[in-house]
Every structure is written in structure tokens, then in C-alpha cells.
Amino acid sequence: MMTGTIETTGNISAEKGGSIILQCHLSSTTAQVTQVNWEQQDQLLAICNADLGWHISPSFKDRVAPGPGLGLTLQSLTVNDTGEYFCIYHTYPDGTYTGRIFLEVLESSVAEHGARFQIP
């Protein structure tokens, strides 16, 4: 019986220009983790392979850093980074386990306040 579960940071928010750590944790299984894929929608952000190490997709290499652990750090956030992120654990012998994180990137409180009361 495959009983593994993925715990994630769930729904999180961060300020524009800041950074955020995306974390997933696989528990309740003795399966061996062979690879973790980090994806946004169906775009590959990064891969951590147990034997071969980390790879960050070229289009994200300036703003994505590996770790901590099997997690992923997103830097220089923009409002376009708002959306769903998935950690996909490839394990042996269970197969794949998928975790979902929703990130909302907010304007900074100063910018938000300024925009709200801006005179046209």
C-alpha cells in the first residue's frame, strides 16, 4: 500500500521584489526519492536529481536558487510570479507524489497605499 503524503507550505504570499522559499516534504513512506521536479503550471523551473544534483531551467536561472534541502528559493518576485507551483517527487518503488503551493505576489504596502490614493 502506497501511503506517502506530501506536506507543503500551502497558500503563501510575498511582496514584490522580495523572495520566498517553496518547501515540500514527503512523509509516511519508506520510498527512495530519486528526483524532485519543481514546476510552474507545466513549465519546468528546476530539477533536483538524487544522483546528478540540481539543474535550474535557463529562463529562471537569474531568479531561482536551489534549496534549502529539496526546496526552491524564488527571488526578485514580480506579480507575474503569482500562481500555482508544484513539487513532483519521483520515488522508488511508489512512483510520483505531487504537492501544490499557491503563491500570491503582492505590491508592497507603500506602493499599494500610494496607488490607491493616486490623483489621476
Partner: antibody, heavy 121, light 110 residues
Framework: EVQLVESGGGLVQPGGSLRLSCAAS????????VPWVRKAPGKGLEWVGY????????YYADEVKGRFTISADDSKNSLYLQMNSLKTEDTAVYYC??????????????WGQGTLVTVSS | RIVMTQTPLSLSVTPGQPASISCQAS??????LAWYLDKPGQPPQLLIS???KLASGVPDRFSGSGSGTDFTLKISRVEAEDVGVYYC????????????FGGGTKVEIK
């Protein structure tokens, strides 16, 4: 236009060798996984092997391991399948195909037309 | 390695009627499940990726669903051009990684 074109198929005797080529155009070949897949007469689709586009290892199906070798020439945007010690059960149409998301979508969106390999005495 | 089991082996459908094909994997594969249509004399065509994402140019009468180990391809109203062999496919990551195809389901028109 994004396309893949295979060549090099033909008739070969059991125990013989053949080298297939796959020429890619319209996309950056080195940034995609391009596996070889075959379809034997009256049989289903069968994965043959591919080069991992990110980490570099080459993987093969058990049925061809030790007999087939895949290589690539990024400067020519081409992939090759060297087939040695051919068996009659290797008779098939051989396709190269593109894995659409940097080689890690694990789904093949572009296929060549295929090249027929016949192993017979 | 993963074993992909498709059912049924063949299907005869009246035009305009729905059709459904199942694919079961020997281990969890979500979300990496794709469906293809293979017609004689043509290369296979990607229909669905990531279990439910319709490929570019594919009619919306095709849909995919499922998660974990069990997946389904549905055709809401079968047309004559839909005849051929349908394959599910996944991928496994281990010491020997690779693509895995189901055995195929032949769809014919009554």
C-alpha cells in the same frame, strides 16, 4: 517549421549493423529530450532510448541495451541511433520524437515520419 | 520499470456516440500521462499531456482525466477520422529512466 526527419533505414541481415539519423529543424535541439521510439509490424509503440538533455546520461530499453548506442551532434542539430547485432525482432519503423517541455514534460509533441528497418536473411 | 495496461484492447463505436479508454499504471505517475493516436501511414499524434491538457490543434471532443495510477481518455462524439490505435504513455525516473507505453486500444467505426 519545427520538424524531425529520420533517415538511414533499410534491409540488413541478422547480426548486422545500421545507423539511423534524425535531423531536427525549427527548434534548439540541445534543449529538448529526443527519444527514439519504434513500432514493429502488428505490435505497439515501444521506447528505444534517449539522451537526458539536462544531466546527460543516455538511457536504453532493456531489449536493446548493449546493442544500440545513441549519440548527438548539437552543431548539426542531429541525433543518431547506432544499431549493432541486429535481430529479426528489431524489424520496425523507427521514429525520433521531441519531448515538448525542455525534455521534462514526458510527452512527445513532434514526431518524424519514421524510417523502416527490416532485419531479415 | 512501469507497466502500462490499457483496456479495452479494441472498441467498435457508432459515429456520434461516446468512447472511453482506460489506462492503469503499475505505480503512481501523476501528472505524467500522455495519450496518442496512431493512424496507419502516419506518425503518432499527441492528443493529451499531463493527464488532461489538450494538445495544440486537437478537437475538444477529446478529454483526459485521472490521477495516481488510473487514467481515462474520452471521446465525446466519435467521428470517422478518430479511427486508429490509441496509446497511453508515461515516464519513470530511477537508475534506468525511460518512457513507457501502453499496449494500445484499436478504435473502429461500426
Amino acid at each position: 517549421e519545427v520538424q524531425l526527419v529520420e533517415s538511414g533505414g533499410g534491409l540488413v541481415q541478422p547480426g548486422g549493423s545500421l545507423r539511423l539519423s534524425c535531423a531536427a529543424s525549427g527548434f534548439d535541439f540541445s534543449s529538448y529530450g529526443v527519444p527514439w521510439v519504434r513500432k514493429a509490424p502488428g505490435k505497439g509503440l515501444e521506447w528505444v532510448g534517449y539522451i537526458d538533455p539536462i544531466f546527460g546520461p543516455t538511457y536504453y530499453a532493456d531489449e536493446v541495451k548493449g546493442r544500440f548506442t545513441i549519440s548527438a551532434d548539437d552543431s548539426k542539430n542531429s541525433l543518431y541511433l547506432q544499431m549493432n547485432s541486429l535481430k529479426t525482432e528489431d524489424t520496425a519503423v523507427y521514429y525520433c520524437a521531441r519531448d515538448y517541455s525542455y525534455g521534462y514534460a514526458y510527452a512527445l509533441d513532434i514526431w518524424g515520419q519514421g524510417t523502416l528497418v527490416t532485419v531479415s536473411s | 520499470r512501469i507497466v502500462m495496461t490499457q483496456t479495452p484492447l479494441s472498441l467498435s463505436v457508432t459515429p456520434g456516440q461516446p468512447a472511453s479508454i482506460s489506462c492503469q499504471a503499475s505505480q503512481r505517475i501523476s501528472p505524467y500521462l500522455a495519450w496518442y493516436l496512431d493512424k496507419p501511414g502516419q506518425p503518432p499524434q499527441l492528443l493529451i499531456s499531463r493527464a488532461s491538457k489538450l494538445a495544440s490543434g486537437v478537437p475538444d471532443r477529446f478529454s483526459g482525466s485521472g490521477s495516481g495510477t488510473d487514467f481515462t481518455l474520452k471521446i465525446s462524439r466519435v467521428e470517422a477520422e478518430d479511427v486508429g490505435v490509441y496509446y497511453c504513455q508515461s515516464y519513470y525516473v530511477h537508475t534506468s529512466s525511460g518512457y513507457a507505453f501502453g499496449g494500445g486500444t484499436k478504435v473502429e467505426i461500426k
